[in-house]
Structures are given as C-alpha cells and as structure tokens.
C-alpha cells in the first residue's frame, strides 16, 4: 500500500479547500488564539512504524470529519466548499482503512496504538470545548481552521519522511 503518495495528495487537496474556506479577516481574530496542544509526539516519525502512523492519521481525519460535520460547522462555512472537503476526507479515510488492514491486522493495530489514538481524540476534545466556550463565534472557527491546517501540514511533512523510508 503506497500510503504516503495517495494520502499526501489528498492532504494537499484538503489543505487547499481549508484555505479557501476563510470568510473573515484573520487579523481581527488574533486575540482568540489558543493552545490546543497538538500531540506532535504522536506523529513523530522517529518513534513510529509506518502502520502506527497510518492509524494516527486515520484518527485525525476521522475526528476532522466529525468536527466539520456538525450543524455549527455547516452554519460557519460555505456549503459547496464544505461538501468538497467532506468528499476529500471521506476518500482519505477509505484509502487509510485499506492501508491499515494491509499493513497490519485491525485488532493488532488498535492494541498497538491505543495511546496515540487517545491523544488525537483528546486533542479534538480540546478543540470542541474551545468552540463551545467561544459560542462557535466566527473568530473561533477561524482559529480552529488555522489549527487544522497546521496539523494537516504537519502530517503531510511527516509523510514525505515516510516516503523516503519506503
């Protein structure tokens, strides 16, 4: 399974869509910045086997899909772009699921990577709590959009490293 190639291209497309989704001037939102504590160590290529990385990426995309599928998200973003974003994420989930089962059995990878998946889930919990606390304001969504773009960029960079190791 050539995960890095397919997933990296999908990530780039998702990033482009995220970039296009901005609706308000980012500069008015500076004071809403927040430390979501992106679990960078979970995506550390030095510590990770390819199969474990796939599992963590899968969880991140699943959680991103969940976050942007809420009714509050639908109210915040352009519907056409959001639909395209869903399709991109859904395609990536399918690619990753195929890779997960090909690299290692589903049960094995779930046991092997439970802590990593939990770290990603807690990260998205913090994002959700932040949005709730900010009453899903336009600036809160802008900050979250920027954060998701950064986490996607980070995983894209890691995949380049994984590709070199293949």
């Amino acid at each position: 399974c050539d995960l890095p190639q397919t997933h990296s291209l999908g990530n780039r497309r998702a990033l482009i869509l995220l970039a296009q989704m901005g609706r308000i001037s980012h500069f008015s939102c500076l004071k809403d910045r927040y430390d979501f504590g992106f679990p960078q160590e979970v995506f550390d290529g030095n510590q990770f086997q390819k199969a474990q990385a796939i599992s963590a990426f899968h969880e991140m995309i699943q959680q991103t899909f969940n976050l942007f599928s809420t009714k509050d998200s639908s109210a915040a973003w352009d519907e056409t772009l959001l639909d395209k974003f869903y399709i991109e994420l859904f395609q990536q989930l399918n690619d990753l699921e195929a890779c997960v089962t090909q690299e290692v059995g589903v049960e094995e990878i779930a046991l092997m990577n439970e802590d990593s998946i939990l770290a990603v889930r807690k990260y998205f919990q913090r994002i959700t709590l932040y949005l709730m606390g900010k009453k899903y304001s336009p600036c809160a969504w802008e900050v979250v959009r920027a954060e998701i773009m950064r986490s996607f960029s980070f995983s894209t960079n890691l995949q380049k490293g994984l590709r070199r190791k293949d």
Partner: antibody, heavy 121, light 107 residues
Framework: EVQLVQSGAEVKKPGESLKISCKGS????????IGWVRQMPGKGLEWMGI????????AYSPSFQGQVTISADKSISTAYLQWSSLKASDTAMYYC??????????????WGQGTLVTVSS | DIQMTQSPSSLSASVGDRVTITCRAS??????LNWYQQKPGKAPKLLIY???SLQSGVPSRFSGSGSGTDFTLTISSLQPEDFATYYC?????????FGQGTKVEIK
C-alpha cells in the same frame, strides 16, 4: 532551513518610489504571515504592518497606514514593502519577519537580515 | 493601541549577575507577550514567546514570566554574549506594539 532573505541596501532621493523585498524559503510560505518592522537610526523597533500571503489580506499600524503598501507574490514566496514618495524621515533599517498567524506558535521566530534605506537629497 | 512600557531603559551589570527587565502593558494582554534580543547591526532574535515559553535554541538562563499587564524577562547568570538591547512585544491584538527597549551594558 528556514530563511528570509531581503533585498539589498537602497539610496534614494526624496519623492522617489521604492519597493523592497523579502523572499522566504525552507517552509510553506502561505502558512505564515509576513510582518514588517522599522528601526530608525539609534531607535527602537516599530511594527509597520503584516500580510497573509495566502490571500494577500493586510493589516497596518495606524502610524504607517497610507504611507506604505505591503504586498506579496506567493508564486515566488516573496513579500514586498513599497513607498510611492519617499521622505528623509523614511531613512531606516527595515526588517521582515514571519508570524504564525492564528496558530499557537512562536511569533516572529525568523527575521530577514534587514534592508537599509537611506533617503537624502 | 496597546502601549508597552519597559523598565529600566538601560542597566549596567557584570558577568554572572542576575538581571531582570520588566514590561507593562496598558491593558490586559493575557500571556501574549514576546521578548527579543538585538545586538548592534543584527536583526532581532526571539527569546521568549507567550510570556514564558523558551524559543528553541535559546539558553535556559533566559526565562519569562507574567500575565495580564505585568511581565518579566530574567537572565539568571549574565554571560558576555548577553550584552545587547532587549525588547518586549505584545501579540494580543493589532496593531502589534513593542516596548522602547532595555539596553544591557557592561558595568
């Protein structure tokens, strides 16, 4: 390696126009904002304005609004600072620096080497 | 605009001294404060971000503290290479603003 490389020193006459540049490399240029900072001879740092290269959205300090124009060309990873009519008081060192935007990350973590602009008749 | 006031504007100290520079904001800026070091003829260098986070590659003798309106930069044991000008800068809201600078000189 992240780098911001600025254009060379300029000597101009009052009333002339000028455009200085700041080229980013070693990182995703559109993922960071680029800010401009002025330092007059023997003085402190003054923030002039900032640009988001992804969509060329800008914000200026009230002190510099209408005095300068900030722009960017993301296709060549370059930000610009320009004057349409220079004054002697524009004589200063100008720095560009990258900013993480709305992300919780270090502000102005990388700086250009500076461009010295001298305006004299 | 948020005004940033640094004190002192200059200080003389010896190698090994503990040095403290303060920065006060005209309104609450939470922890959105950065500290920079600048040496003559060089670009500023980020030392501390978000009030207390040490920038990668910066020696641990530098530390920052504070929140709201009052902030401090501390150099626990001054080294020869630390003689420079230090600036605080708020990143809470636009326009971004710097303090006027504190020059640390050799006694």
């Amino acid at each position: 390696e992240v780098q911001l490389v600025q254009s060379g020193a300029e000597v101009k006459k009052p009333g002339e126009s000028l455009k200085i540049s700041c080229k980013g490399s070693g990182y995703s240029f559109t993922s960071y904002w680029i800010g401009w900072v002025r330092q007059m001879p023997g003085k402190g740092l003054e923030w002039m304005g900032i640009i988001d290269p992804s969509d060329s959205d800008t914000a200026y300090s009230p002190s510099f609004q209408g005095q300068v124009t900030i722009s960017a060309d993301k296709s060549i990873s370059t930000a610009y600072l320009q004057w349409s009519s220079l004054k002697a008081s524009d004589t200063a060192m100008y720095y560009c620096a990258r900013h993480p935007g709305l992300n919780w990350a270090p502000d102005f973590d990388y700086w250009g080497q500076g461009t010295l602009v001298t305006v004299s008749s | 605009d948020i005004q940033m006031t640094q004190s002192p504007s200059s200080l003389s100290a010896s190698v090994g001294d503990r040095v403290t520079i303060t920065c006060r904001a005209s309104q609450s800026i939470d922890r959105a404060l950065n500290w920079y070091q600048q040496k003559p003829g060089k670009a500023p260098k980020l030392l501390i971000y978000f009030a207390s986070s040490l920038q990668s590659g910066v020696p641990s003798r530098f530390s920052g503290s504070g929140s709201g309106t009052d902030f401090t930069l501390t150099i626990s044991s001054l080294q020869p290479e630390d003689f420079a000008t230090y600036y605080c800068q708020q990143s809470f809201d636009f326009p971004l603003t710097f303090g006027q600078g504190t020059k640390v000189e050799i006694k």
